[in-house]
């Protein structure tokens, strides 16, 4: 199973922690960057760089931040109400199918394909056929000669929950 | 299918420590509160208290501070229990339950393990 | 603590027939939030309670229709609308409107 949960997987969200500021449900639920309390008469504001949520709720405990892992850069800082943004290093990509590690980009398209997208934190450069213009699938064939190219540069953060 | 299985029973003596444990399956274990109640015979329900897989925060019943203890293996989706010092008075059945992470829905159980037999006599 | 007690703590029942049973709190269920956290489990012999009825009148997924709760405040009911041979067994009220969450004695049903 995944060791991750995401306001989105929780829907809303919170946890208690001593001589945080407190103030009282509206409707049974708490504002983003806090959590309601054990007996439902409270919320308690998450703990910065700690822990956060992002929308009314009333879970009993907030979502611990992200820690971007070795490989991705920190684009911003966990905050009360926004989980950690963490990006893949310039050179690598995060598939969608595997969002736990980047990988790194191709440097190059296979033998009679050309390069029409660069590298992004979030897609490996795309090629396609010469003539064709049909995308290739993605893995390098063995022994095939490639055309280098350099990683692009982001053009947007990729935003990863946690 | 959620499933909670429990481990077996126990006879212990005055005194002594057990631990039970609670191997749930069938759901995403760190999603759900592991609730643990106590079945004295012939008697009603106490809830214990529970515990947070996401975090590993617990929230006691007052009565239970310092009487249970509850931990979990995430790697094994198992939750445990540990009651210290025992007496006779521990003797019941001890019953881990899920509920849900929000307070709206997290006072009520929709799953419980069979039940494990704790008796204490010398 | 709150205190939940429960009548009659025994009901001898006839199939078909409808059953009743009462559930009281020492104090009022109905929090800040305007819900009301009472609920009803079933503990047939030799099992581990089940969940019925969750929030006064919510039948948890799978229960017979035969079973309803109703009540507000301190005065709680569980209805059974024709009593089946499966349905015996201790039923017993709960709150979670007030930590620390506490039971009702429980109401034994039983087979004239």
């Known amino acids: 199973e995944s060791a991750l949960i995401t306001q989105q997987d929780l829907a809303p969200q919170q946890r208690a922690a001593p001589q945080q500021k407190r103030s009282s449900p509206s409707e049974g639920l708490c504002p983003p960057g806090h959590h309601i309390s054990e007996d439902g008469r409270d919320c308690i504001s998450c703990k910065y760089g700690q822990d956060y949520s992002t929308h009314w709720n009333d879970l009993l405990f907030c979502l611990r931040c992200t820690r971007c892992d070795s490989g991705e850069v920190e684009l911003s800082p966990c905050t009360t109400t926004r989980n950690t943004v963490c990006q893949c290093e310039e050179g690598t990509f995060r598939e969608e199918d595997s969002p736990e590690m980047c990988r790194k980009c191709r440097t190059g398209c296979p033998r009679g394909m050309v390069k029409v997208g660069d590298c992004t934190p979030w897609s490996d450069i795309e090629c396609v056929h010469k003539e064709s213009g049909t995308k290739h699938s993605g893995e390098v064939p063995a022994v095939e000669e490639t055309v280098t190219s350099s990683p692009g540069t982001p053009a947007s953060p990729c935003s990863l929950s946690g | 299918e959620v499933q909670l299985v429990q481990s077996g029973a126990e006879v212990k003596k005055p005194g002594a420590s057990v631990k039970v444990s609670c191997k749930a399956s069938g759901y995403s274990f760190i999603g759900y509160f592991m609730n643990w109640m106590k079945q004295s015979p012939g008697m009603s329900l106490e809830w214990i208290g529970r515990f947070n897989p996401y975090n590993e925060d617990t929230f006691y019943n007052q009565k239970f501070k310092g009487k249970a203890t509850l931990t979990v293996d995430k790697s094994t989706s198992t939750a445990y229990m540990e009651l210290s010092s025992l007496r006779s008075e521990d003797t019941a059945v001890y019953f881990c339950?899920?509920?849900?992470?929000?307070?709206?829905?997290?006072?009520?159980?929709?799953?419980w393990g069979q039940g494990t037999l704790v008796t204490v006599s010398s | 603590d709150i205190v939940m007690t429960q009548s009659p703590l025994s009901l001898p029942v006839t199939p078909g027939e409808p059953a009743s049973i009462s559930c009281r709190s020492s104090?009022?269920?109905?929090?800040?939030?305007?819900?009301?956290?009472l609920h009803w489990y079933l503990q047939k012999p030799g099992q581990s309670p089940q969940l019925l009825i969750y929030k006064v009148s919510n039948r948890f997924s799978g229960v017979p229709d035969r079973f309803s709760g109703s009540g507000s405040g301190t005065d709680f009911t569980l209805k059974i609308s024709r009593v089946e041979a499966e349905d015996v067994g201790v039923y017993y009220c709960s709150q979670s409107t007030h930590v620390p969450w506490t039971f009702g004695p429980g109401t034994k049903v039983e087979i004239k």
């Open positions: 339950a899920r509920s849900a992470y929000y307070f709206d829905s997290g006072g009520y159980f929709d799953y």
């Open positions: 104090q009022s269920l109905v929090h800040s939030n305007k819900n009301t956290y």
